[in-house]
């Protein structure tokens, strides 16, 4: 009788060791989610505060309307010019109407004068029509004044007024473009 | 560090399509671009095209692919798409991954052939 009372004992002790057990992950767990809640909090806290302090363009763009543009400092063929746009998450600038170029003239006379500045658009070797990069076809205003007798790949590039083209492994300056942020705050 | 891996490729008749995946694994916030390259035996690796990571994004295509390749993504599966539409013997390459990052290396994928063949 008595090895019986002591084995119950000693189940109910192993009972009570394991719900002390679940207890103690229970409250781990517990401060766990509470550490990860704060977190969260903490997270998103920030990126709405950065989000409400960003400005729609990053340092050194200039602002359009709902675009942002960086005028390079360095020259480059015009294949290098788009990849280091790509790299700053943006593409060559893609002139959608006289207004934008006007701007972006207006901007070049301010900031460098009379340079050459690659933008994104290429003459098709096959059928020779001007494309932007992303496949649109230019307005018939914007399309480059005939300069380059080139065999090679030809490409458009702007100098003061007017969209001009040439050899695309030609070195320039560049123009990127991307979108601006919109505040949604 | 970031893991591109590329799948889709294959051999395909003249006038066929192809969609190649590119999905980003790990810690892709510095990635501010994603594009597809090409490289053919004997040439030099070509960008075919290329899509901003930006909410808005913008997208950039080699003319030799304009109205047949489409490129887009798939944000919740951080994966790139590359639909290839009227392939030609000349489309045949290894296609690359390029993950572009500002002011640092960019991360590539290990490839996959394309075969156009009749």
């Known amino acids: 009788k008595l090895l019986q009372v002591s084995t119950i004992a000693m189940q109910q002790q192993e009972k009570l060791i394991q719900q002390e057990r679940a207890l103690l992950n229970f409250t781990e767990w517990k401060r766990s989610c509470a550490l990860q809640m704060k977190y969260c909090q903490a997270f998103m806290q920030n990126s709405l505060s950065s989000a409400h302090n960003s400005s729609p363009c990053p340092n050194n763009w200039i602002q359009n309307r709902e675009s942002c543009y960086y005028v390079s400092e360095i020259w480059s063929i015009w294949h290098t010019s788009q990849e280091n746009c790509l790299k700053e998450g943006s593409t060559l600038l893609q002139i959608e109407s006289k207004e934008e170029m006007d701007f972006i003239t207006g901007s070049l006379r301010k900031i460098k004068g009379s340079y050459d500045y690659w933008v994104g658009l290429s003459q098709d070797g096959h059928s020779g029509r001007w494309l932007w990069q992303d496949g649109s076809s230019p307005s018939p205003g914007l399309l480059p004044a005939e300069r380059s007798q080139s065999a090679n790949q030809v490409c458009g590039y702007v100098k003061s007024n007017s969209l001009l083209s040439s050899n695309c492994s030609t070195w320039k300056y560049f123009i990127c473009e991307k979108y601006a942020l919109r505040s949604s705050v | 560090q970031v893991q591109l891996q590329e799948s889709g490729g294959g051999l395909v008749q003249p006038g066929g399509s192809l969609r190649l995946s590119c999905a980003a694994i790990?810690?892709?916030?510095?990635?501010?671009?994603m594009g597809w390259y090409r490289q053919a035996p004997g040439k030099q690796r070509e960008l075919v095209a290329a899509i901003t990571s930006a909410s808005a994004s913008r997208t950039t295509y080699a003319d030799s692919v304009k109205g047949r390749f489409t490129i887009s993504r798939d944000n919740a599966k951080n994966t790139v798409y590359l639909q290839m539409n009227s392939l030609q013997p000349e489309d045949t390459a290894v296609y690359y991954c390029?993950?572009?990052?500002?002011?640092?290396?960019?991360?590539w994928g290990q490839g996959t052939q394309v075969t156009v063949s009749s």
């Open positions: 390029k993950g572009f990052r500002s002011g640092a290396d960019d991360y």
């Open positions: 790990g810690n892709i916030a510095s990635i501010t671009a």
